[in-house]
């Protein structure tokens, strides 16, 4: 015997209590799928949370981070600091990236300059607290004559700056 | 972590009335569908009703006796209970949960519980 419950639309519950009859689901609520039992409590965008998309009877609000933050953990349950470019956030707030490290972005950690001896190749371009290193060729492939730039002096390998 | 306590429960005569209320702690009632269940002696868990922006959802027993109502500002729920009856004798729990009605969920969280006893 089919359950009467399957003939209600996403957007209402079934109601136990009045014969499985479908009544909508109240504002600020919201049913995905048919045949549901309950609706759903609505996600609220409330502080460092904005509404990204309004809740609906079938679906639920989608949240952002306001300026200065962004989204962390799915469907953006948290809100983390942004920093600048060259920093990274900790316990204490924005640092600066120490000596031989770098970050490109507003967020994440600040993580070591390539080593550009490793894949034996030279420092094109010196890192920043904001950049990597760019490597260029190889010493052996700037042979004599080939061209005219004279190598950067390497960069310091990563480390510490003094405090 | 929330708390919910319940209050407003005790002795009242046939036909009477009872205001339960039930404060939340630790976390605003705004974000929940809030309500009640009630236990007699000897008896299963029984729901008695659910309270979601601005709409009440009732048990099937209660006959328009019962009224759940909140205070978002107080962080509180009220359940009114008029003609009380001798079958309405129950420990009366408030509840809250991300789902409404709560007539066929167990709730996120839920109080203590207050005694009340309808007898003359």
């Known amino acids: 015997l089919q359950d009467p419950c399957s003939n209600c639309p996403a957007g209402t519950f079934c109601d136990n209590n009045r014969n499985q009859i479908c009544s909508p689901c109240p504002p600020n609520s919201f049913s995905s799928a048919g045949g549901q039992r309950t609706c759903d409590i609505c996600r609220q965008c409330k502080g460092v949370f904005r509404t990204r998309k309004e809740c609906s009877s079938t679906s639920n609000a989608e949240c952002d981070c306001t300026p200065g933050f962004h989204c962390l953990g799915a469907g953006c349950s948290m809100c983390e600091q942004d920093c600048k470019q060259g920093q990274e956030l900790t316990k204490k707030g924005c640092k600066d990236c120490c000596f031989g490290t770098f970050n490109d972005q507003k967020r994440g950690i600040c993580r070591p300059w390539t080593n550009c001896s490793l894949d034996g190749k030279s420092v094109l371009v010196n890192g920043t607290k904001e950049r990597d290193v760019v490597c260029g060729p190889s010493p052996a492939d700037l042979s004599p004559g080939a061209s005219s730039v004279t190598p950067p002096a390497p960069a310091r390998e990563p480390g510490h700056s003094p405090q | 972590e929330v708390q919910l306590l319940e209050s407003g429960g005790g002795l009242v005569q046939p036909g009477g009335s009872l205001r339960l209320s039930c404060a939340a702690s630790g976390r605003t009632f705004d974000n929940y569908a809030v309500g009640w269940f009630r236990q007699a002696p000897g008896k299963e868990r029984q729901y008695v009703g659910t309270?979601?922006?601005?709409?009440?959802h009732y048990g099937d027993f209660e006959n328009n006796r019962f009224t759940i109502s909140r205070d978002n500002s107080k962080n509180t729920l009220y359940l009114q209970m008029n003609s009380l009856r001798a079958e309405d004798t129950a420990v009366y729990y408030c509840?809250?949960?991300?789902?409404?009605?709560?007539?066929?969920?167990?709730?996120?969280?839920q109080g203590q519980g207050t005694l009340v006893t309808v007898s003359s």
């Open positions: 509840a809250i949960s991300l789902k409404y009605p709560m007539a066929t969920v167990t709730p996120d969280y």
């Open positions: 309270y979601w922006s601005g709409y009440a």
